[in-house]
């Protein structure tokens, strides 16, 4: 009696269980009663990443330098090429089909987490006692200068965008 289901890494065709082609290979011809499944390795710049019965291999992804993309990991016959973005840019998605310039944190905000090839800069507001006077993708909020430790007094209060201004203490004559 012909099978209705096949084992793992097999497929049913013409009432027969044939072996799937292994990753990195494509199907040339199905098995018969007398012959095994015929598979061929994928060509240069092609891949198949699963046990399969595909008659065509997939093309490796192209990391388009015009979009700021570069190869992070070269593809093999069993894996696709992995793209990433050039320095200062990050991928728009997991598939990394295009890039976006890293966000800068505006004055009053500091960098909580520096951007990577796949994630954007994370900014945070500078809390009381801290400031940032620049727009930057790297700078954290800086603590206000401690006037006391310099034997000075606060002449002008700090804000989230400016440091305190220290000055000499009034001397009592």
């Amino acid at each position: 009696e012909p099978p209705t289901a096949c084992r793992e890494k097999q497929y049913l065709i013409n009432s027969q269980c044939c072996s799937l082609c292994q990753p990195g290979q494509k199907l040339v011809s199905d098995c018969t009663e007398f012959t095994e499944t015929e598979c061929l390795p994928c060509g240069e710049s092609e891949f198949l990443d699963t046990w399969n019965r595909e008659t065509h291999c997939h093309q490796h992804k192209y990391c388009d330098p015009n979009l700021g993309l570069r190869v992070q990991q070269k593809g093999t016959s069993e894996t696709d090429t992995i793209c990433t973005c050039e320095e200062g840019w990050h991928c728009t998605s997991e598939a990394c089909e295009s890039c976006v310039l890293h966000r800068s944190c505006s004055p009053g905000f500091g960098v909580k987490q520096i951007a990577t090839g796949v994630s954007d800069t994370i900014c945070e507001p500078c809390p009381v006692g801290f400031f940032s006077n620049v727009s930057s993708a790297f700078e954290k909020c800086h603590p206000w200068t401690s006037c006391e430790t310099k034997d000075l007094v606060v002449q002008q209060a700090g804000t989230n965008k400016t440091d305190v201004v220290c000055g000499p203490q009034d001397r009592l004559r």
Partner: antibody
Framework: QSVEESGGRLVTPGTPLTLTCTVS????????IHWVRQAPGKGLEYIGI?????NIVYATWALGRFTISKTSTTVDLKITSPTTEDTATYFC??????????????WGPGTLVTVSS | DVVMTQTPASVSEPVGGTVTMKCQAS??????LAWYQQKPGRPPKLLIY???TLASGVSSRFSGSGSGTEFTLTISDLECADAATYYC??????????FGGGTEVVVK
Amino acid sequence: QSVEESGGRLVTPGTPLTLTCTVSGFSLSAYAIHWVRQAPGKGLEYIGIIDAGGNIVYATWALGRFTISKTSTTVDLKITSPTTEDTATYFCGRGLSSYSNSAMDLWGPGTLVTVSS
Amino acid sequence: DVVMTQTPASVSEPVGGTVTMKCQASQNIYTYLAWYQQKPGRPPKLLIYQASTLASGVSSRFSGSGSGTEFTLTISDLECADAATYYCQSTAGNAYNAFGGGTEVVVK
């Protein structure tokens, strides 16, 4: 598919004003929406964007002056404390994709905001 | 921030002529650049995106080129209907989607 701005009117300086961009024929979960303005007789000025995922980014000059938010079919632009310099026609535009790095292929006719005392 | 500089501010050419305008970015934006046409009282219309890709329904008389920091928009076989102001825009994403100052095209 269309986008249309509304809410533009004459306001006095300091009076908050909310503009609305109403979209139809496409989903805001698939496209980014940009806000752009144009002062009378001047060029285009980029304000900010809300992408499909709800991430909001403002042009540096616009930080603190505007607030962008969205519902399922509308995107709002709030001018927090208008000054006479904010007198302009405000446009919303649909991005070609869901991301912030996309050009705008669909624009509304614009809504005029006049700030005057 | 990315600053976009357009030249010339204005250009005048006869019908049938060719107009070329330039757009310079203050930093490398690869090919993340769009061109728009705007006529008085109308919203901008997308002509070209990704520096050289023609937007849907746009005449092939419009062409864009360049990458990095230098970009060009060319209008060939100029028609009266091409009289408008043309803007370039960085589409590098985030807060970097700045516009250039515009180039006015006058058709004689």
